[in-house]
C-alpha cells in the first residue's frame, strides 16, 4: 500500500490509501505514540478504513496507522523477516488537524437596528459521559467564528468575530442584509478555517423581525 492519507472533518476520520487490490487484501492497525496497536478493517478489499471510533477516544492524542498487505488466500507473512508487508501513515493529531466542516447559520433575529445571528453548534462524534459533544464543547475558546455580512443591495462586506456561537451586529433600518459564517481556529498552523457557510439573507425563513 502507498499514499496513506488521513481524511478527517469534524473528527469523522477515514484513512485512505492506494492501490485498489487485485489479488490481496488489507488490514489496518492504529495506535497512539505510546499505545498498543489495534487492528481494524480486517482483510478488506477496500482502500479506506473508518477510524473515527478510535480517534474520538482522545482527540488530543497523536495517532499512527499502518496498512498490512496480504496475498489473497494467504494471511501469512509476505515479508523477508516473516512479517506481512506494511506501510506507515503520517502522524495525525485530530484536535490539531481535523478539517472544520462547513458551518450553518441556525437563525437570525432583527430587533430594531441590531441583528442577532446564531451559528449552529454542530454535534461531533466525540463522546463524553455517553453524550456526543458539540464542536464548541470540544474546541472551547480555540474555536471562533467570523461573520461576513453585507447589504443585499451592495457587495461591500463587513466582518465580525465571536468567541461564542452568537453575533450581535448593527444594521441600517429598512435594509436587508445577507450573512455567511466561517469557523476558525486561530492557534492552528494547518486547516485553520472552514469553508464559508451557505449564505442566508433577511426576508428568508430563518429570520425574525421585531421592532
Amino acid at each position: 500500500a502507498f499514499n496513506l492519507t488521513w481524511i478527517s472533518t469534524d473528527f469523522k476520520t477515514i484513512l485512505e490509501w492506494q492501490p485498489k487490490p487485485t489479488n490481496y487484501t488489507y488490514t489496518v492497525q492504529i495506535s497512539t505514540k505510546s499505545g498498543d496497536w489495534k487492528s481494524k478493517c480486517f482483510y478488506t478489499t477496500d482502500t479506506e478504513c473508518d477510524l473515527t471510533d478510535e480517534i474520538v477516544k482522545d482527540v488530543k492524542q497523536t495517532y499512527l496507522a499502518r496498512v498490512f498487505s496480504y496475498p489473497a488466500g494467504n494471511v501469512e507473512s509476505t515479508g523477508s523477516a516473516g512479517e506481512p508487508l506494511y506501510e506507515n501513515s503520517p502522524e495525525f493529531t485530530p484536535y490539531l488537524e481535523t478539517n472544520l466542516g462547513q458551518p450553518t447559520i441556525q437563525s437570525f433575529e432583527q430587533v430594531g437596528t441590531k441583528v442577532n445571528v446564531t451559528v449552529e453548534d454542530e454535534r461531533t462524534l466525540v463522546r463524553r459521559n455517553n453524550t456526543f459533544l458539540s464542536l464548541r464543547d470540544v474546541f472551547g475558546k480555540d474555536l471562533i467564528y467570523t461573520l461576513y455580512y453585507w447589504k443585499s443591495s451592495s457587495s461591500g462586506k463587513k466582518t465580525a468575530k465571536t468567541n461564542t456561537n452568537e453575533f450581535l451586529i448593527d444594521v441600517d433600518k429598512g435594509e436587508n442584509y445577507c450573512f455567511s459564517v466561517q469557523a476558525v481556529i486561530p492557534s492552528r498552523t494547518v486547516n485553520r478555517k472552514s469553508t464559508d457557510s451557505p449564505v442566508e439573507c433577511m426576508g428568508q425563513e430563518k429570520g425574525e423581525f421585531r421592532e
Partner: antibody
Amino acid sequence: QVQLQESGPGLVKPSQTLSLTCTVSGGSISSGQYWSWIRQHPGKGLEWIGEIYYSGSTRYNPSLKSRVTISVDTSKNQFSLKLSSVTAADTAVYYCARDAPYYYGGGYYYYMDVWGKGTTVTVSS
Amino acid sequence: EIVLTQSPGTLSLSPGERATLSCRASESVDSSYLAWYQQKPGQAPRLLIYGASTRQTGIPDRFSGSGSGTDFTLTISRLEPEDFAVYYCQQAGVVPYTFGGGTKVEIK
C-alpha cells in the same frame, strides 16, 4: 449572583500534589462559561494557570502544562486544580474565577468577571 | 508568549488628580481580548474594563480605557480615595493568557 469559593490544604510538602477545589454557588457550572485558575506569588503579579469548560475542554499555561490537571464535576457544581511535583516556587495565593462572555464589537468575548477570595498555599516541609 | 509591560511601576498622586497607566504588549493584541483589573490589598482582582475600552457594569465613568495593537492605556480622570490600588492589564487572546506586572497607584 454567582459566587466562587476555593478550598483545599494550606500547606503542601515539596514533591507532593497540590489539590484545590472551587465551588460555584448562585449559578450553574454548565451555563456556557469557562472556569479558570490563577495564582499570585507573594508580593508579585498574576499568573494564569488554565481553564476548563463544563464539557471538560481545557487550556493550560504551557509553562505548567506538564504538572497541571483541571477537572470539572458538574453534579457538584465544582471544578478542581491539581498541581503535581510542587516546590517552594509554587507557594502563592490561588484564585478561581469565572470567564463569562461579554458583548464587544459585534461578537462575544470572555473575561474573568467573578473571582473567589483566594486561598494561600504554602509549599514547605 | 505575549509579554505585557506596565508603566510606571508606581504612580504617586493625590486624590482628584488624573492617573494615566500604560500597558505595552510584546506583539499585537486584538483589542477584543484586552482587559484591565483593579486589585486592593488582601482582595481578589476586579474586572474594570474589557475590550480595551468598555467599562464593566457598575464601574464609575471616571475609569476609561483606550488603545489598540501594542499600546493600551487606562485613565482615571479624577482619583477618588478608593481608587488607590494596583492595576493589571491582561490579554486573553493567545494562550498563555498573560497579565502585566501591575501599576501601583499610591497616595502622594
